[in-house]
């Protein structure tokens, strides 16, 4: 049976928590990604940013989970209108910011 949206979001949050708590060396070797606007279309925007990070096993599960939330196909190099113009941040900071936002969505009951 399909996973309820609340469960899917909670699983994504748990995965991001695991990433931030288990981080020893710099996440994804300190790779930089485009910062995104967290106010709308967060799942697709996050995927569009993170999909450009390759060879980083620590975030592969996150990428797969975000893919399940995003209704359209996302490919590397895709430009997002939700990208914060010309601002790049480390993957570790991106994950922390995304986690804070998703936890707020969960607490508000916004599961879709």
């Amino acid at each position: 049976s399909p996973v309820p949206p609340s469960t899917a979001l909670k699983e994504l949050i748990e995965e991001l928590v695991n990433i931030t708590q288990n981080q020893k060396a710099p996440l994804c070797n300190g790779s930089m990604v485009w910062s995104i606007n967290l106010t709308a279309g967060v799942y697709c925007a996050a995927l569009e940013s993170l999909i450009n990070v390759s060879g980083c096993s620590a975030i592969e599960k996150t990428q797969r989970m975000l893919n399940g939330f995003c209704p359209h196909k996302v490919s590397a190099g895709q430009f997002s209108s939700l990208r914060v113009r010309d601002t790049k941040i480390e993957v570790a900071q991106f994950v922390k910011d995304l986690l804070v936002h998703l936890k707020k969505l969960f607490r508000e009951g916004q599961f879709n």
């Epitope: 609340s6 469960t7 909670k10 949050i13 936890k103 707020k104 969960f106 607490r107 009951g109």
Partner: antibody
Framework: EVTLRESGPGLVKPTQTLTLTCTLY??????????VDWIRQPPGKGLEWLAH???????RYNPALKSRLTISKDTSKNQVVLKLTSVDPVDTATYYC???????????????WGQGTLVTVSS | DIQMTQSPSSLSASVGDRVTISCRAS??????LNWYQQKPGKAPKLLIF???KLHSGVPSRFSGSGSGTDYTLTISSLQPEDIATYYC?????????FGGGTKVEIK
């Protein structure tokens, strides 16, 4: 030391509004990841969750009572207030407030409880 | 809403006995299961959160286990001060819901 203390009217008449206050000691509701819940327990019965408020003013209610409940906080007084409108004798219960901390995963586990305040609804 | 069913509703055991209380959820709660102890006339106290994590100050004779829909609270050696009603609570989905309680008495 973390302590919560409920205060209320004790006796309320049917159709009136019940106002309960929870005063927090040893922690602040302005601190990230802190939340406060209200739970009630009718005499000799089990526990029923009523409402929750997070440090950033996100509020959630039990759908069965949502239309009658309002939860709010006064950070300056370190208090959380619950209002229950149109009370009925079936609302007679001990009302508890409790703290929830969500560090990392969102647990919804109430780690410290107040002593409770008994509210009787009767004319 | 998720229904939480506890069994037994009451039990009587001797000091030193191993006591087991069961809690079943109407759907998978993914280990977001908490246990509380309530003594007569007192507020509930958190014993165990997230299925098996002991809250600070709780004696090690209390333990929790389970997954999916089925969870267990175990008291390895019952003590006189353990006389209380025990409640399970799911913390996975709002509204938060509690089991009906298990009253533990000494034989």
């Amino acid at each position: 030391e973390v302590t919560l203390r409920e205060s209320g009217p004790g006796l309320v008449k049917p159709t009136q509004t019940l106002t309960l206050t929870c005063t927090l000691y040893g922690f602040s509701l302005s601190t990230s990841d802190m939340g406060v819940d209200w739970i009630r327990q009718p005499p000799g019965k089990g526990l029923e969750w009523l409402a929750h408020i997070w440090w950033d003013d996100v509020k959630r209610y039990n759908p069965a009572l949502k239309s009658r409940l309002t939860i709010s906080k006064d950070t300056s007084k370190n208090q959380v207030v619950l209002k229950l409108t149109s009370v009925d004798p079936v609302d007679t219960a001990t009302y508890y407030c409790a703290r929830t901390v969500s560090s990392g995963y969102i647990y919804y586990a109430m780690d410290y409880w107040g002593q409770g305040t008994l509210v009787t609804v009767s004319s | 809403d998720i229904q939480m069913t506890q069994s037994p509703s009451s039990l009587s055991a001797s000091v030193g006995d191993r006591v087991t209380i069961s809690c079943r959820a109407s759907q998978d709660i993914r280990n977001y299961l908490n246990w509380y102890q309530q003594k007569p006339g007192k507020a509930p106290k958190l014993l165990i959160f997230y299925t098996s994590k002991l809250h600070s100050g709780v004696p090690s004779r209390f333990s929790g286990s389970g997954s999916g829909t089925d969870y267990t609270l175990t008291i390895s050696s019952l003590q006189p001060e353990d006389i209380a009603t025990y409640y399970c609570q799911q913390g996975n989905t709002l509204p938060l819901t509690f089991g009906g309680g298990t009253k533990v008495e000494i034989k």
